[in-house]
C-alpha cells in the first residue's frame, strides 16, 4: 500500500517517499522506484538553507553600498549573505535592507547607549551636576568641574549645556 506520510527529510511524490535535497543543493529530479532523488549544488552566489525540494536556489542578498550597506558575513551555498551598515549608520529594519545615519545627542543630552549596526543612538538628558556642550553620537554627559577641589569657587553655575565657571576665592561677593 502506498505511503500517506514520509519520514523526516523525505517528501511524498507519486505515492512514493523521496529524499529531500540537503542544504546547499537543489532538486534536479525526483526519485523513482529505481533511482534516488537527484540533487545539484547551488551555483556561486546562490544558497538553500534547508532540506528542500526546490528546483532553484535563492540568490544571495546584495549589500548595496548606495544604501549604506556592507557585507558582514559572506554567504555560502547553505547561508545567505548578512548585510550590516557602514560605520556611523544603522539598519532601518531587522532585515537590514537599508541604513540611516546614527542620531547625535544634542547639547544638554548625553549618549546613554552608543548605536550599533542594528540600533540607533539612545540619548538621555543631562541631569543637574552634568552637562554636554556638543552634538555627538558618542559623548556621555560630563560632570561639572568641582571648583572646591581646585581651591576655587563657583563664579557661574553650570547648566545642562555648560560647565561651571570657577574663579579665585577673593572674587566671592
Amino acid at each position: 500500500e502506498p505511503p500517506t506520510a514520509c519520514r523526516e527529510k523525505q517528501y511524498l511524490i507519486n505515492s512514493q517517499c523521496c529524499s529531500l535535497c540537503q542544504p546547499g543543493q537543489k532538486l534536479v529530479s525526483d526519485c523513482t522506484e529505481f533511482t534516488e532523488t537527484e540533487c545539484l549544488p547551488c551555483g556561486e552566489s546562490e544558497f538553500l538553507d534547508t532540506w528542500n525540494r526546490e528546483t532553484h536556489c535563492h540568490q544571495h542578498k546584495y549589500c548595496d553600498p548606495n544604501l549604506g550597506l556592507r557585507v558582514q558575513q559572506k554567504g555560502t551555498s547553505e547561508t545567505d549573505t548578512i548585510c550590516t551598515c557602514e560605520e556611523g549608520w544603522h539598519c532601518t529594519s531587522e532585515a537590514c535592507e537599508s541604513c540611516v545615519l546614527h542620531r547625535s545627542c544634542s547639547p544638554g543630552f548625553g549618549v546613554k547607549q552608543i548605536a550599533t549596526g542594528v540600533s540607533d543612538t539612545i540619548c538621555e538628558p543631562c541631569p543637574v551636576g552634568f552637562f554636554s556642550n556638543v552634538s555627538s553620537a558618542f559623548e556621555k554627559c560630563h560632570p561639572w568641574t568641582s571648583c572646591e577641589t581646585k581651591d576655587l569657587v563657583v563664579q557661574q553655575a553650570g547648566t545642562n549645556k555648560t560647565d561651571v565657571v570657577c574663579g579665585p576665592q577673593d572674587r566671592l561677593r
Epitope: 538621555e124 543637574v128 551636576g129 556621555k140 568641582s146 563664579q155
Partner: antibody, heavy 122, light 113 residues
C-alpha cells in the same frame, strides 16, 4: 547645626512688593544653594527657584520669572526673595531650604526654614 | 518640565498598618552614568515645614526611622511605611531633582481611620 531662620509674617496690599529673608547658620553659606518653595493655603509645594550665594547665580521656575527676585548677602549669610506686583493669588507660605552644597550630589532639600506667611489683601 | 503624579491623594489607615504611596514621573529619573534616581520624599505636618525622609529614591535621611523605605526606578517609585505610628499621620510629597524646574507630586495625606 544647620539652621535656616526666616523673617516674620507679612500682610501686603495688592500691587505692592515684599522681601522675605532667610538667615543661614551652621554651614558654608556661600557654596550651598538656597532653594525657595511656596505653598498656597491647602495646596501642595511649588518650587520657585534657587540662588548660589557666592556667585549670585540663579535658577528660576519659568512661572515665577518677573515675580520673584533672589539676592544674597554673604557677609550676613542671608538670602532674600523679593516678590513684586503682589496679587491675592500670591498669598502663601514661602519656604527657603538648603540645596546642593557644592558636591553636586545633594540637590534634595535637607534643611528648611520655618516658613514665612505672606498674605495679600486689600 | 517633568510632571510628578502621586497616588492616592489620601489614605485612611490605623496605627500598625502598612501604607504604600506611589509616585510616577513623566520621564525617567534614572541617570545611566551614576545609576542614580533623582527622587526625594518629604513628610509635612500641619503648620510645619516639610522634612526630608528619603533621597536618591531609596536612601534614608539620617535620623529617619527604618519603618520608612523608598523603592522604584526610572519612572515609578514607592514610599512605604511598614508599621504606621501615631506621629506618621501627615502629608507626604515626592520631588524630582533631575533637571530644572524641580517639581513635587501633589501630596498624599495619611489620615487616621
Amino acid at each position: 547645626q544647620v539652621q535656616l531662620v526666616q523673617s516674620g509674617a507679612e500682610v501686603k496690599k495688592p500691587g505692592s512688593s515684599v522681601k522675605v529673608s532667610c538667615k543661614a547658620t551652621g554651614y558654608t553659606f556661600s557654596t550651598s544653594w538656597i532653594e525657595w518653595i511656596r505653598q498656597a493655603p491647602g495646596q501642595g509645594l511649588e518650587w520657585i527657584g534657587s540662588i548660589l550665594p557666592g556667585s549670585g547665580s540663579t535658577n528660576y521656575n519659568e512661572k515665577f520669572k518677573g515675580k520673584a527676585t533672589f539676592t544674597a548677602d554673604t557677609s550676613t549669610s542671608t538670602a532674600y526673595m523679593e516678590l513684586s506686583s503682589l496679587r491675592s493669588e500670591d498669598t502663601a507660605v514661602y519656604y527657603c531650604a538648603r540645596g546642593d552644597d557644592g558636591s553636586y550630589v545633594r540637590w534634595y532639600f535637607d534643611h528648611w526654614g520655618q516658613g514665612t506667611l505672606v498674605t495679600v489683601s486689600s | 518640565d517633568i510632571q510628578m503624579t502621586q497616588s492616592p491623594s489620601s489614605v485612611s489607615a490605623s496605627v500598625g498598618d502598612r501604607v504604600t504611596i506611589t509616585c510616577r514621573a513623566s520621564q525617567s529619573l534614572l541617570f545611566s552614568v551614576n545609576q542614580k534616581n533623582y527622587l526625594a520624599w518629604y513628610q509635612q505636618k500641619p503648620g510645619k515645614a516639610p522634612k526630608l525622609l528619603i533621597y536618591w529614591a531609596s536612601t534614608r535621611e539620617s535620623g529617619v526611622p527604618d519603618r520608612f523605605s523608598g523603592s522604584g526606578s526610572g519612572t515609578d517609585f514607592t514610599l512605604t511605611i511598614s508599621s504606621l505610628q501615631p506621629e506618621d499621620f501627615a502629608t507626604y510629597y515626592c520631588q524630582h531633582y533631575y533637571s530644572y524646574p524641580w517639581t513635587f507630586g501633589q501630596g498624599t495625606k495619611v489620615e487616621i481611620k
